[in-house]
């Protein structure tokens, strides 16, 4: 495929990545799927600076990111190593809380109103952020 060299319309470029900020809500899996259909992934936060960038754009609103522990350990959707990477959990989080009465625990991570992270029920309809890296090969076939 061809390399993407600039961001699609309505996406925001920052540090060689493109970001799209939703204004509606979806369950985590639907948000994840939405990003994949855009040849992107739910946002993966790898630094203090990227955290600040995303925080600035989403404001004080619960927003899904590309981090989950639905299969056991916490994993970033793009394969970024969780254990050695940037983290910004709220105190006492993640707690895999079962007391919400919706069945199961809490397996998906989101930005809270102050930007710090919380784990929550993946079915909650939160906003989300998609990210795609510039210079990565796009899935579209090259123009002949």
């Amino acid at each position: 495929g061809s390399e993407r060299t600039c961001c699609p319309v309505n996406w925001v470029e920052h540090e060689r990545s493109c970001y799209w900020f939703s204004r509606s809500g979806k369950a985590w899996a639907d948000a994840d799927n939405y990003c994949r259909l855009e040849d992107a992934h739910l946002v993966v936060v790898t630094s203090w600076e990227e955290q600040k960038f995303v925080q600035h754009h989403i404001g004080p609103v619960n927003t899904w990111m590309g981090l989950h522990d639905q299969n056991g350990p916490w994993k970033w959707v793009d394969g970024t190593d969780y254990e050695t990477g940037f983290k910004n959990w709220r105190p006492e989080q993640p707690d895999d809380w079962y007391g919400h009465g919706l069945g199961g625990g809490e397996d998906c991570a989101h930005f809270t109103d102050d930007g710090r992270w919380n784990d929550d029920v993946c079915q909650r309809p939160y906003r989300w952020v998609c990210e795609t890296e510039l210079d990565k090969a796009s899935q579209e076939p090259p123009l002949l």
């Epitope: 630094s47 203090w48 600076e49 600040k52 925080q55 600035h56 940037f86 983290k87 105190p91």
Partner: antibody, heavy 118, light 107 residues
């Protein structure tokens, strides 16, 4: 009320080590990130290091990376800074500061003076 | 690293004056700019955070504005207790960096 009290400063020879401590009270220490910031005599402020509330992240200024180590003991409400291979340019008043929302220093200690001199 | 440049480095003013201090960042820091006041021999005190939010307990004569790379701290009607050094500080990215300070002296 929030209180931060630094200790451990003093005169030390170049190349030697020193350990600073910051005793916190008046707030839930384990819920806040903490920083060290220093100020050389007659100079401006210089950020030194930060540690997350749960120790998941630690960051350092390039000038101290590999020589200084920030740590905390949430059970004792204590922040520490282990300073090795000290240099004359590390001479400063060292402040501990509480982090309110990723890099906002909302409370500071009174500072402890470190003098590196032969 | 992001360089923070304050101007002026010092100024003389009288009680009742309106004082403005400028801080410029070497790159876009959005609104992640904080202001601190430091009196002689004392620890700094937070005045303004995220460019324009007044810290609890700080008098309303202090205000902040700006975004991106240019920021200002304004003191309306300077009071005797306001004579001090003022520092700007970016919290957009590590390493966190400060301006060199602005000393506000009595004229």
């Amino acid at each position: 009320q929030v209180q931060l009290v630094e200790s451990g400063g003093g005169v030390v020879q170049p190349g030697r080590s020193l350990r600073l401590s910051c005793a916190a009270s008046g707030f839930t220490f384990s819920s806040y990130g903490m920083h060290w910031v220093r100020q050389a005599p007659g100079k401006g402020l210089e950020w030194v290091a930060v540690i997350w509330h749960d120790e998941t992240n630690k960051y350092y200024a390039d000038s101290v990376k590999g020589r200084f180590t920030i740590s905390r003991d949430n059970s004792k409400n204590t922040l520490s800074l282990q300073m090795n291979s000290l240099r004359a340019e590390d001479t400063a008043v060292y402040y501990c500061a509480r982090d309110e929302r990723l890099g906002i220093f909302d409370y500071w200690g009174q500072g402890t003076l470190v003098t590196v001199s032969s | 690293d992001i360089q923070m440049t304050q101007s002026p480095s010092s100024l003389s003013a009288s009680v009742g004056d309106r004082v403005t201090i400028t801080c410029r960042a070497s790159q876009n820091i959005r609104n992640y700019l904080n202001w601190y006041q430091q009196k002689s021999g004392r620890a700094p005190k937070l005045l303004i955070y995220v460019a324009s939010s007044l810290q609890s307990g700080v008098p309303s004569r202090f205000s902040g504005s700006g975004s991106g790379t240019e920021f200002t701290l304004t003191i309306n009607s300077l009071q005797p207790e306001d004579f001090a050094i003022y520092h700007c500080h970016q919290s957009n990215s590590t390493p966190l960096t400060f301006g060199q300070g602005t000393k506000v002296e009595i004229k």
